[in-house]
Interface confidence: low
Amino acid sequence: SPVPPSTALKELIEELVNITQNQKAPLCNGSMVWSINLTAGVYCAALESLINVSGCSAIEKTQRMLNGFCPHKVSAGQFSSLRVRDTKIEVAQFVKDLLVHLKKLFREGQFN
């Protein structure tokens, strides 16, 4: 049976914590991704950005978990209007920003 939204979000947050806390070298070899607008549609936007990173095992689980939150199919190369125009940041910073934002959502009880 599907897990409750609160449990799924908690698991996603804890995976992001694992990534941020366990870095011994630049995450994904310092790969850059498009920054996103965190105020709406965050899961799909995050997936659309991270899906363009390949060959980085550290974020594969995060990519799969985000896919479970996003109601539509996401493929590499596509990007919605939620992208922050012409702004790229390192994957490590992206994951960190996403983590802090999702922690706020969790505290506020916004699980979907």
Epitope: K10, I13, E14, V17, N18, T20, Q21, N22, Q23, K24, P26, L27, A92, Q93, K96, L99, V100, K103, F106
Partner: antibody, heavy 122, light 108 residues
Framework: QMQLVESGGGVVQPGRSLRLSCAAS????????MHWVRQAPGKGLEWVAV????????HYADSVKGRFTITRDNSKNTLNLQMNSLRAEDTAVYYC???????????????WGQGTMVTVSS | SYVLTQPPSVSVAPGQTARITCGGN??????VHWYQQKPGQAPVLVVY???DRPSRIPERFSGSNSGNTATLTISRVEAGDEADYYC???????????FGGGTKLTVL
């Protein structure tokens, strides 16, 4: 209101033992990770130990490992620190502090007790 | 084990901006928390998760974190801000909480 109150401090000789307690009130104790942090006179903060919300995991600073034991009793809303083989360098104010557990150990200490003084001296 | 480095002291005139730094290897990838401690009192959380503020803390307190340096910024400094400030992270490689050595903020 939410409160943490430490007790059990005092003067003790090197090599002896002491047991500190921390009484929690005003919040759901069993859902929080709990820590001990100490501060030697005129020095900075030094983390001592953590115990998970359910007591399932415990971690200690290298300086106290094997000598100190952290425990909790969720039915009594109490945190304890058993300190054995005390040394002069253990002299400090000992604080208990809580950290929301759902984020495991990355969370901040959002509530502190006022501290209890431990002096190890012959 | 992981080390956090803070300047021992920072001085600032009232009304000016104080910046207290906390250095650590790849600290930008960690969640940094800041505490204020006044003489004879327990520490108080002033910034958590790099830049969030507990509700009772004035907006004058803010934080940032990237690269190898986290920064606590106190704008429009007041005499009551004089205290010791500590940064803190969790070091997953050792399963330890780590505090910086502390910075004494003096309001001139």
């Amino acid at each position: 209101q939410m409160q943490l109150v430490e007790s059990g401090g005092g003067v003790v000789q090197p090599g002896r033992s002491l047991r500190l307690s921390c009484a929690a009130s005003g919040f759901t104790f069993r859902t929080y990770g709990m820590h001990w942090v100490r501060q030697a006179p005129g020095k900075g903060l030094e983390w001592v130990a953590v115990i998970w919300y359910d007591g399932s995991n415990k971690h200690y600073a290298d300086s106290v490992k094997g000598r100190f034991t952290i425990t909790r009793d969720n039915s009594k809303n109490t945190l304890n620190l058993q300190m054995n083989s005390l040394r002069a360098e253990d002299t400090a104010v000992y604080y208990c502090a809580r950290a929301p557990q759902w984020m495991l150990v990355a969370e901040a200490f959002d509530l502190w007790g006022q501290g209890t003084m431990v002096t190890v001296s012959s | 084990s992981y080390v956090l480095t803070q300047p021992p002291s920072v001085s600032v005139a009232p009304g000016q901006t104080a910046r207290i730094t906390c250095g650590g290897n790849l600290i930008g990838s960690k969640l940094v928390h800041w505490y204020q401690q006044k003489p004879g009192q327990a520490p108080v959380l002033v910034v958590y998760d790099d830049s969030d503020r507990p509700s009772r803390i004035p907006e004058r307190f803010s934080g940032s974190n990237s690269g190898n340096t986290a920064t606590l910024t106190i704008s429009r400094v007041e005499a009551g801000d004089e205290a010791d400030y500590y940064c803190q992270v969790w070091d997953s490689s050792s399963d330890h909480v780590v505090f910086g050595g502390g910075t004494k903020l003096t309001v001139l």
